[in-house]
Interface confidence: low
């Protein structure tokens, strides 16, 4: 196809010889075509254009990329000729740096919607060169880490040696989307969340007398977490006594907050103390009821089919533990005054008698 009508952009990749880094080209198709190809997922069903390409082939890239050989040979299909370059929707990812990546890259819609779209293409002239050794020793890494829950910043590697005052205007992208909130050589993050992780691209313009280039760098940002230094705390039950009605079913809930741990093995169990004996109770599985970046709230219930006289003499203990330590909360049952008639009490005593027999045989098995 004729590429003379393609819009042209010049980019410079100055790669560090000390580190492995990636590079990304965006297929910046002129609007409004771009929205049809790259951002389909952002369109609501009522906004879908009539001639939207690839409605049956979601997994195929929406644009086609080519490389233009410098000797004037026909355009090369990147997927076939360059295994170190990955085509991903509207981006081209270079997995390895090197001057051999220098060249002209052309992107166009995989499927044109009308004859007028033949010129809907972008030609990117990419110059790749190693960063000179004279440049700043402490330049920012192409892999940067942010500690979850704290403040942090993401620096543009090609500009990290310049003060904010000297720095040119920078355009930032995250996972291919423009970030309009910052124009400086670093992004300050007031509180780091998981969503801050991703692939960031920073662009700035460098001009000489002859022409103007976009200098681009790619930063892989990962979010990391520090372990809690606290043992879990029990949120419920708060009170150490609980008023109950004899003969009625009862559920006691234990809720505890566990701080984040890199290997999370929370322990939560109920056990019963009766005189000198204590045993763990088989209760329903614990479940997570709230999960945040820094902690998780887990709940586990103990269920009594009917409260008996014996239960009033027992202590019900919720035990929780993480790698730092454990916490317990004891609950004593207390009969509600004026509750239940004679029938309820008689029923409760019958249950108690059956339970005593069951407990004694269970006890005998264990010892």
């Amino acid at each position: 196809f004729n590429i003379s009508g393609c819009s042209t952009k010049k980019l410079l990749w100055a790669y560090s010889t000390r580190s492995e880094e990636e590079f990304i080209l965006f297929c910046d198709l002129p609007e409004p075509q771009k929205s049809h190809f790259c951002h389909r997922s952002q369109l609501s069903p009522t906004q879908v254009p009539d001639h939207l390409p690839f409605t049956d082939s979601k997994d195929l890239p929406d644009v086609q990329w080519y490389r233009q050989p410098s000797n004037g040979d026909p355009l090369e299909d990147i997927r076939k000729s360059y295994p170190h370059i990955i085509q991903d929707k509207c981006t081209l990812r270079f997995l390895t740096p090197g001057v051999n990546n220098t060249g002209s890259y052309i992107c166009r819609p995989k499927m044109i919607k009308s004859p007028y779209d033949v010129a809907c293409c972008v030609k990117m002239i990419l110059e790749v060169k190693p960063q000179s050794n004279a440049s700043c020793e402490n330049s920012a890494s192409h892999k940067q880490d942010l500690l979850l829950g704290s403040t942090g910043s993401i620096s543009c590697p090609s500009l990290s040696c310049q003060s904010d005052a000297q720095s040119p205007e920078v355009t930032w992208y995250k996972n291919g989307k423009l970030l309009s909130m910052t124009r400086s050589n670093r992004i300050v993050v007031d509180e780091v969340y998981i969503y801050h992780q991703g692939t960031y691209v920073c662009d700035y313009t460098q001009s000489d007398t002859a022409s103007s280039w976009t200098v681009r760098a790619v930063v892989q940002v990962r979010t990391i977490v520090g372990d809690t230094k606290l043992k879990p705390d029990i949120l419920d039950p708060v009170e150490s006594t609980l008023e109950v009605e004899l003969g009625k079913p009862l559920t006691i809930s234990c809720k505890a907050r566990f701080g984040f741990e890199r290997v999370f093995n929370p322990v939560m169990k109920w056990y019963i103390k009766d005189a000198d004996l204590e045993w763990e109770v088989s209760v329903p599985e614990a479940k997570s009821i709230k999960s945040t970046l820094k902690d998780e709230i887990i709940e586990r219930n103990i269920i009594l089919e009917k409260v008996t006289q014996r239960d009033l003499r027992r202590t019900f203990v919720c035990f929780v533990q993480n790698s730092i330590g454990n916490t317990t909360q004891s609950v004593q049952l207390k009969e509600k005054r004026g509750s239940g008639g004679l029938n309820d009490i008689f029923e409760a005593q019958k249950i108690e008698w059956h339970e005593t027999v069951r407990f004694q045989s269970h006890h005998h098995h264990h010892h």
């Epitope: 402490n138 890494s141 880490d145 500690l147 704290s150 998981i194 992780q197 990962r222 979010t223 990391i224 977490v225 520090g226 372990d227 230094k229 890199r262 290997v263 093995n265």
Partner: antibody, heavy 124, light 107 residues
């Protein structure tokens, strides 16, 4: 670019204490976990333990009684001490950075930056 | 401790071959598995995390798969620089453990 530089003696006498230090350059020791791993000659890798910059440690139970890992944030370094060594402790010892990667629904930790390795021989 | 068993212990292959290494865990570890490459006299190099996610800068001919107890590392088309020893590592529970390694040699 974070780099790890290991230092310490290559020869230790039996029953003595092996001491190695790992210095972090090109980045801060803060906010990361740091591990020690060893590899006996011709064998596989064995994790010794980790330390968080705050001082929290976790050791391999098989070595726990003999291992101490400490951190000095002011010097940007962390250290390994292994007491009462025997010939079975002869190995290449590596220090490494552990990073947490938010992958799918969970956090997984991998050792993404390694020291150059120190060959330690236990012999009289 | 969770044991990781790699197979085969060693294998010979030629440049351009497709190679698969397996790693079996003694109990389920979800997808908390990483793969490393080690060349003689060098420190291990991190390749894959979360069983199948490729570390930045690792060539796309490397791929990982699996979940639970059975995992594989595949090199789709062997290059001369791929001849090395490969280790799997679990981070699901302490102590962290590694497989015994698979030595990949030139045929």
């Amino acid at each position: 670019q974070v780099q790890l530089q290991q230092s310490g003696p290559g020869l230790v006498k039996p029953s003595e204490t092996l001491s190695l230090t790992c210095t972090v350059s090109g980045g801060s020791i803060n906010n990361y976990y740091w591990s020690w791993i060893r590899q006996p000659p011709g064998k596989g890798l064995e994790w010794i333990g980790y330390i968080f910059y705050s001082g929290t440690t976790n050791y391999n139970p098989s070595l726990k009684s003999r291992v101490t890992i400490s951190v000095d944030t002011s010097k940007n370094q962390f250290s390994l001490k292994l007491s009462s060594v025997t010939a079975a402790d002869t190995a290449v010892y590596y220090c490494a950075r552990d990073v947490g990667i938010a992958a799918r629904n969970s956090y997984y930790y991998v050792m993404d930056v390694w020291g150059q390795g120190t060959t330690v021989t236990v012999s009289s | 401790a969770i044991q990781l068993t790699q197979s085969p212990s060693s294998l010979s292959a030629s440049v351009g071959d497709r190679v698969t290494i397996t790693c079996r865990a003694s109990q389920g570890i979800s997808s908390a598995l990483a793969w490393y490459q080690q060349k003689p006299g060098k420190a291990p190099k991190f390749l894959i995390y979360d069983a199948s996610s490729l570390e930045s800068g690792v060539p796309s001919r490397f791929s990982g798969s699996g979940s639970g107890t059975d995992f594989t590392l595949t090199i789709s088309s062997l290059q001369p620089e791929d001849f090395a020893t490969y280790y799997c590592q679990q981070f699901n529970s302490y102590p962290i453990t590694f497989g015994q390694g698979t030595r990949l040699e030139i045929k």
